[in-house]
């Protein structure tokens, strides 16, 4: 015999109190699959969490974090403080990128500057903690008589020592 509840679609629940009629989920609840005997309470995005997607009768609300924080965990269960550009989040908190590395995001890790010479190119613009180097044309690409751009010595940024 087929379970009458299996006919209840997402957004409803099989109401045992009403002869297993499919009843709509009450306000602030949802069922994401058919055949459910109860609806789940909608997640509320409060405090440091803000609503990214409202709850509907068939899907839970989705949260993200307020500015200055980013999500951790399945479904954004926690918020972690953003670092600044030019930093990375380490086990000891936000740390400046080491010399020769950069991070142009407020999360993620510091990555090494591009090595222009590997592509036979020269450094057009020096890298910083926040930006990668910009590689210029290879010396061979330059027209005769044009002055080539030579990679400058990696001058340390003021007050920024290698870690």
């Amino acid at each position: 015999l087929q379970d009458p509840c299996s006919n209840c679609p997402a957004g409803t629940f099989c109401d045992n109190n009403r002869n297993q009629i499919c009843s709509p989920c009450p306000p602030n609840s949802f069922s994401s699959a058919g055949g459910q005997r109860t609806c789940d309470i909608c997640r509320q995005c409060k405090g440091v969490f803000r609503t990214r997607k409202e709850c509907s009768s068939t899907s839970n609300a989705e949260c993200d974090c307020t500015p200055g924080f980013h999500c951790l965990g399945a479904g954004c269960s926690m918020c972690e403080q953003d670092c600044k550009q030019g930093q990375e989040l380490t086990k000891k908190g936000c740390k400046d990128c080491c010399f020769g590395t950069f991070n142009d995001q407020k999360r993620g890790i510091c990555r090494p500057w591009t090595n222009c010479s590997l592509d036979g190119k020269s450094v057009l613009v020096n890298g910083t903690k926040e930006r990668d180097v910009v590689c210029g044309p290879s010396p061979a690409d330059l027209s005769p008589g044009a002055s080539s751009v030579t990679p400058p010595a990696p001058a340390r940024e003021p007050g920024h020592s290698p870690q």
Partner: antibody, heavy 116, light 107 residues
């Protein structure tokens, strides 16, 4: 830096009520939920509930639904917890703590002693 | 409610030891596990959040690991200032729940 300063120890009579305070500093008070935790030697740490200072919305542990009332005053950056109809079971240390999905900053704790 | 169990209520170790404290959840908590340190004066501090992320200012001798229902906190080189009680706590579901605590003492 972020700090939560709680009110001083309380000695109260059985049946009375008491209101504990938790003053926040060093961050935007309305931007984070404030949670309250009870600690006793026998039962350890127990979650009482939480308040969103921005909206005044609350969540309670069913065990404390009739015991605790959480409020917050954005103008003074202070969260409050009223404990009602006190009995010796309510003698404990109570902590407020800021929530990020984890409790990153804790208050100093308030000791409540219920005794006649 | 999700039950959090710390089977060892007290632990005795020597300075310099590697100490591991375990915590078990009654259901899968998907790494939503945090560790706190409570000093004898009652001060509580966050050590580790989301199973393994070290809170800012916490010494790197502290580390966390685990998944599903089983989690642990490790102190790699025990120092005098680590004498405290350590609690795990889940953030998977309300109500938030804590382990019973593990009191760490010097042998």
């Amino acid at each position: 830096q972020v700090q939560l300063q709680q009110s001083g120890a309380e000695l109260v009579r059985p049946g009375a009520s008491v209101t504990l305070s938790c003053k926040a500093s060093g961050y935007t008070f309305a931007g984070f939920e404030m949670h309250w935790i009870k600690q006793t030697p026998v039962h350890g740490l127990g979650w009482i509930g939480a308040i969103d200072p921005k909206t005044g919305g609350t969540d309670y542990n069913q065990k404390f639904k009739d015991k605790a009332l959480l409020t917050a005053d954005k103008s003074s950056n202070t969260a409050y917890m009223e404990l009602r109809s006190l009995t010796s079971e309510d003698s404990a240390v109570y902590y407020c703590t800021r929530d990020l999905g984890y409790f990153d900053v804790w208050g100093t704790g308030t000791t409540v002693t219920v005794s006649s | 409610d999700i039950q959090m169990t710390q089977t060892t209520s007290s632990l005795s170790a020597s300075l310099g030891d590697r100490v591991t404290i375990s915590c078990r959840a009654s259901q899968d908590i998907r790494s939503n596990l945090n560790w706190y340190q409570q000093k004898p004066d009652g001060t509580v501090k966050l050590l580790i959040y989301y199973t393994s992320r070290l809170h800012s200012g916490v010494p790197s001798r502290f580390s966390g690991s685990g998944s599903g229902t089983d989690y642990s906190l490790t102190i790699s080189n025990l120092e005098q200032e680590d004498i405290a009680t350590y609690f795990c706590q889940q953030s998977e579901k309300l109500p938030r729940t804590f382990g019973g605590g593990t009191k760490l003492e010097i042998r």
